[in-house]
């Protein structure tokens, strides 16, 4: 199994562009995550989906951020427009 | 029927602390994310703070980071603003608020903030 | 600080008029949210995502707008419409609001 597939590994970007992180869950997982990791605040959940439906995205309530999930193998998080204290580590995880 | 209501203002002194609640029902706080936002008397409406429903995403406004400390108890279904060295310019009303919708779609009726001596 | 303002800060018409209030931000914003308040209530949740109406409004209310310059419009006055109306943003926070529009009985 490959594991959670997240692209890009590396992103820059120039403040106000947006950005979109993709992510591919494992295959038969019905949960998905996106969390942000910086040094001032640690890990942050931002969003979770259970069976592709956004169950809790209080983590992100800057509306500069969305998130889909449009079928149980994929989902993107968007940041519109992006801004220098977005850069940070971002992680999709999944679960049964 | 979703209920917000906020408690624990009342008169302080300059410098002093007050710790206000809101006491939520009628829907799962667990799963929303919760703002407080005053308003001073014959003012507008300003925002004070956010937190995530699992209380690791928190935002506050600038003037008052330092000062003013959000939290939250899941298990009793509460939101909390801890607020020290208190100024004659934080007497407002205080309210507590639902993130739904991408903004604030409940509110509680308020909590009075007097700050003087 | 992305900063809203609004236009007008005072504003008196009459039952089944048509009024429309603007509100600017500083900086671009993604969508403009919108909320009615009472004297001595809290304030209620209007308009969210810049044009859609909250569970249980009015569908004389609308809401519109991109960019810097959004706009709340009542298409025909009703005398419970009489309150103060603010917009804000969460596009960055601190999720600023704007000062306000008092909307008055001529």
């Known amino acids: 199994d490959a594991g959670v597939i997240q692209s890009p590994r590396h992103e820059v970007t120039e403040m106000g562009q947006e950005v979109t992180l993709r992510c591919k869950p494992i295959s038969g997982h019905n949960s998905l995550f996106w969390y942000r990791q910086t040094m001032m605040r640690g890990l942050e959940l931002l969003i979770y989906f259970n069976n592709n439906v956004p169950i809790d995205d209080s983590g992100m309530p800057e509306d500069r951020f969305s998130a889909k999930m449009p079928n149980a193998s994929f989902s993107t998080l968007k940041i519109q427009p992006s801004e220098p204290r977005d850069s940070a580590v971002y992680f999709c995880a999944s679960s049964l | 029927e979703v209920q917000l209501v906020e408690s624990g203002g009342g008169l302080v002194q300059p410098g002093g602390s007050l710790r206000l609640s809101c006491a939520a029902s009628g829907f799962t706080f667990s799963n929303f994310g919760m703002h407080w936002v005053r308003q001073a008397p014959g003012k507008g409406l300003e925002w004070v703070s956010y937190i995530s429903s699992g209380s690791k995403t928190i935002y506050y406004a600038d003037t008052l980071k330092g000062r003013f400390t959000i939290s939250r108890d899941n298990s009793k279904n509460t939101l909390y603003l801890q607020m020290n060295s208190l100024r004659a310019e934080d007497t407002a009303v205080y309210y507590c608020?639902?993130?739904?919708?991408?903004?604030?779609?409940?509110w509680g009726q308020g909590t009075t903030v007097t700050v003087s001596s | 600080d992305n900063q809203l303002t609004q236009s007008p800060s005072f504003l008196s018409a009459s039952v089944g008029d048509r009024v429309t209030i603007t509100c600017r931000a500083s900086?671009?914003?993604?969508?403009i949210y919108w909320y009615q308040q009472k004297p001595g209530k809290a304030p209620k949740l209007l308009i969210y995502y810049t044009s859609n109406l909250a569970p249980g409004v009015p569908s004389r209310f609308s809401g519109s707008g991109s960019g810097n310059e959004y706009t709340l419009t009542i298409s025909s006055l009703q005398p419970e419409d009489f309150a103060t109306y603010y917009c804000?943003?969460?596009?960055?926070?601190?999720?600023?609001f704007g000062q306000g529009t008092k909307l008055e009985i001529k």
């Open positions: 900086s671009s914003v993604n969508y």
């Open positions: 608020a639902r993130r739904g919708e991408g903004a604030m779609d409940y």
């Open positions: 804000q943003q969460f596009t960055s926070s601190p999720f600023t």
